[in-house]
C-alpha cells in the first residue's frame, strides 16, 4: 500500500476580514492511525489552530465528521477572520504513539490572505 500523503489542494486563499475561511485538506490513506492537527506557520513558533484529539477550538469547525471511521477529509473552516489570522496553514497527520503522538506527514500549506473589510 502507498504511503499516506496529506493533500492541501489550495496554495492560497483570500478572505475578507470578518468572513469565514475554508482550508481544505485530505489524506490518501487511513493508515497510520492517528489524529490530524492544523497549524499556522512552521517550526517551533507555529500556532496550534485545531487538534482533532483534544482541546476546545471555538472558531474552528470541521467540514466533515472526523469521528466517522473512514473519513479522510480534514478540511476546516475558521470563522470571523482578522488580519492576525493571515499566514500559511499546515494540515499535519500524526501517528498514534505513547505517551505522545508523533508527527508523521505535513501538507504543503495553504496561504491565507486577509482583505480589509471595506468601510
Amino acid at each position: 500500500e502507498e504511503e499516506l500523503q496529506v493533500i492541501q489542494p489550495d496554495k492560497s486563499v483570500l478572505v475578507a476580514a470578518g468572513e469565514t475561511a475554508t482550508l481544505r485538506c485530505t489524506a490518501t490513506s487511513l493508515i497510520p492511525v492517528g489524529p490530524i492537527q492544523w497549524f499556522r506557520g512552521a517550526g517551533p513558533g507555529r500556532e496550534l489552530i485545531y487538534n482533532q484529539k483534544e482541546g476546545h477550538f471555538p472558531r474552528v469547525t470541521t467540514v466533515s465528521d472526523l469521528t466517522k471511521r473512514n473519513n479522510m477529509d480534514f478540511s476546516i473552516r475558521i470563522g470571523n477572520i482578522t488580519p492576525a489570522d493571515a499566514g500559511t496553514y499546515y494540515c499535519v497527520k500524526f501517528r498514534k504513539g505513547s505517551p505522545d503522538d508523533v508527527e508523521f506527514k505535513s501538507g504543503a500549506g495553504t496561504e491565507l490572505s486577509v482583505r480589509a473589510k471595506p468601510s
Epitope: 513558533g45 507555529r46 496550534l48 483534544e54 471555538p58 482578522t82
Partner: antibody, heavy 119, light 108 residues
Framework: DVQLVESGGGVVRPGESLRLSCAAS????????MNWVRQAPGEGLEWVSR????????DYADSVKGRFTISRDNSKNTLYLQMNSLRAEDTAVYYC????????????WGLGALVTVSS | ETVLTQSPATLSVSPGERATLSCRAS??????LAWHQQKPGQAPRLLIY???NRATGIPDRFSGSGSGTDFTLTISSPQTEDSAVYYC??????????FGGGTKVEIK
Amino acid sequence: DVQLVESGGGVVRPGESLRLSCAASGFSFRSYAMNWVRQAPGEGLEWVSRINSGGGGTDYADSVKGRFTISRDNSKNTLYLQMNSLRAEDTAVYYCAKQYDWNSFFDYWGLGALVTVSS
Amino acid sequence: ETVLTQSPATLSVSPGERATLSCRASQTVGSKLAWHQQKPGQAPRLLIYDASNRATGIPDRFSGSGSGTDFTLTISSPQTEDSAVYYCQQYYYWPPYRFGGGTKVEIK
C-alpha cells in the same frame, strides 16, 4: 473548572531576578496560548508576554523585552516568567491568563502574584 | 498600534439605574473586543467577548454592543456587587494586546 494559580512573587532589590510560576488545571493546557499581564499599584492592566501552545513562539511588551523570558512545561501544566534586571517600575501584581483560542481574548485569569522591587 | 480609550473614568450610579460605559479604538478592531470586570483586590474576570457575547455565568444585565471603533458596555440594572473597574481589550491586531485605561463604576 479552569484554575490558574501563580506563585513565586516576593520582594527583591533593583537588578535582581525572580521567577514566577503559574500552575494550570481543568483544561488541555498544551492546546492553548498563555499570557502574563501585570497591574502596577492603582494602575490599569498591562500585557507583558505571550507564549504559543507548543512553547516555541513568544511575544513581549517593549517595556520588558530583553529582560523577561516566558516559557512553559506542557508535561507539568505550568507557565513561567523569568524576570531579570528588575526595576522599581516592574512592581506589580502579575496575572497569568489563558487565551480562548490562539488569536483571541483572555477567558480565564489567575489570582495574581505580587512582585515588589525596592531598595 | 491600536489605542483604546475608555470613558468616563469614573461612573457613579444608583442601584437599578442604567450604566453605560464607552470604549473607543484608534482604528477598527472589527468585533474583536472583550470586556473584563475587576473587583477590588480580585483578579479580572471576562464579561463580554466578540463585542456582544456574554461569557459563561455572566448575568444578562450585562450587555455589549458596537463594532469597528465604538463599543459600549451596558449594565441595565446595576447591583451593589457590580462596583468594579471595567476594562476593554482588543485582539484584532497584536502583539501587543491592548487594554483600555478602565472605567470605575461606583454604585451609590
